[in-house]
Interface confidence: medium
């Protein structure tokens, strides 16, 4: 099998930050805050940011929010929603983060780095 194309610094940083969050939870992440689930498809970085930006006062995801800001090509503010949100489904931030992490890992396996 061919070797993987090295991921961009931002994506590598995002994956490693998501790993850090999922692996080092000592208490419910963001006090068990709920966020809108998203469709993990094109535009997911902006959609993920739109969900997570509505979580306030949770230092554990500040860095993730900052990295997603860099990966999303347009400005995102709290209360903003795109069609990528599954608006009838809310999940805990911890599950959201892990789902995003596993999806990114799958994309890397398949060679889709953007």
């Amino acid at each position: 099998s061919p070797g993987p194309v090295p991921p961009s610094t931002a994506l590598r940083e995002l994956i490693e930050e998501l790993v850090n969050i999922t692996q080092n939870q000592k208490a419910p992440l963001c006090n068990g805050s709920m966020v809108w689930s998203i469709n993990l498809t094109a535009g997911m970085y902006c959609a993920a940011l739109e969900s997570l930006i509505n979580v306030s006062g949770c230092s554990a995801i500040y860095r993730t929010q900052r990295i997603l800001h860099g990966l999303c090509p347009h400005k995102v503010s709290a209360g903003q929603f795109s069609s990528l949100h599954v608006r009838d489904t809310k999940i805990e931030v911890a599950q959201f983060v892990k789902d995003l992490l596993l999806h990114l890992k799958k994309l890397f396996r398949e060679g889709q780095f953007n």
């Epitope: 099998s1 070797g3 993987p4 994956i15 999922t22 939870q25 892990k98 799958k106 890397f108």
Partner: antibody, heavy 122, light 108 residues
Framework: EVQLLESGGGLVQPGGSLRLSCAAS????????MSWVRQAPGKGLEWVSA????????YYADSVKGRFTISRDNSKNTLYLQMNSLRAEDTAVYYC???????????????WGQGTLVTVSS | SYVLTQPPSVSVAPGQTARITCGGN??????VHWYQQKPGQAPVLVVY???DRPSGIPERFSGSNSGNTATLTISRVEAGDEADYYC???????????FGGGTKLTVL
């Protein structure tokens, strides 16, 4: 096709040393972390050590730390395990395993060698 | 250090469903991989990333992970599924790979 071929096992006396090798082929060796996992006769799998693709980061089980050294030569597509101060409890089949992803903390092992037997006995 | 607990043995009749559990503190926050090992052979990855299957592994093998338990489910069990099964995670607090103690699946 991914292939991992271990060698270097054998009989060694307690306190002795042994160097295991794992020749890899069928993938871009330097892009993946590698690991050694052992299995004592009739027992379960026990992780021994791992190394990042570049070789810059190494990890060891507490039971072997300070006695075993993992290394790799990416120009030769080969993984090594230098085992010193061997004990009877190190007797096991030693497997070389390829990690499934570049980020070390997501490690699963998608390919394994057939193993090499290390017997520590006087 | 992080501990993964598996039942030593699980027995199931052919054609039935086998469920092998792997318990760990908040294991749902971790990424779990499962291996099958037959006597005298090297382990084989059968489920990775909690629930994904490598190519070549039958759809009968599936995984789930939440709370304090990860589960490997083998539906329509066949005699050839008889083997030892191990769960595995990465423990970031110790920078160690951790394996469960293994479960021997017996097909009656």
């Amino acid at each position: 096709e991914v292939q991992l071929l271990e060698s270097g096992g054998g009989l060694v006396q307690p306190g002795g040393s042994l160097r295991l090798s794992c020749a890899a082929s069928g993938f871009t060796f330097s892009s993946y972390a590698m690991s050694w996992v052992r299995q004592a006769p009739g027992k379960g799998l026990e992780w021994v050590s791992a190394i990042s693709g570049s070789g810059g980061s190494t990890y060891y089980a507490d039971s072997v730390k300070g006695r075993f050294t993992i290394s790799r030569d990416n120009s030769k597509n080969t993984l090594y395990l230098q085992m010193n101060s061997l004990r009877a409890e190190d007797t096991a089949v030693y497997y070389c395993a390829k990690a499934d992803f570049w980020s070390g903390t997501l490690w699963g092992f998608d390919y394994w060698g057939q193993g090499t037997l290390v017997t520590v006995s006087s | 250090s992080y501990v993964l607990t598996q039942p030593p043995s699980v027995s199931v009749a052919p054609g039935q469903t086998a469920r092998i559990t792997c318990g760990g503190n908040n294991i749902g926050n971790k990424i779990v991989h499962w291996y099958q090992q037959k006597p005298g052979q090297a382990p084989v990855l059968v489920v990775y990333d909690d629930s994904d299957r490598p190519s070549g592994i039958p759809e009968r093998f599936s995984g789930s992970n939440s709370g304090n338990t990860a589960t490997l489910t083998i539906s329509r069990v066949e005699a050839g599924d008889e083997a030892d099964y191990y769960c595995q995670v990465w423990d970031s607090s110790s920078d160690h790979v951790v394996f469960g103690g293994g479960t021997k699946l017996t097909v009656l």
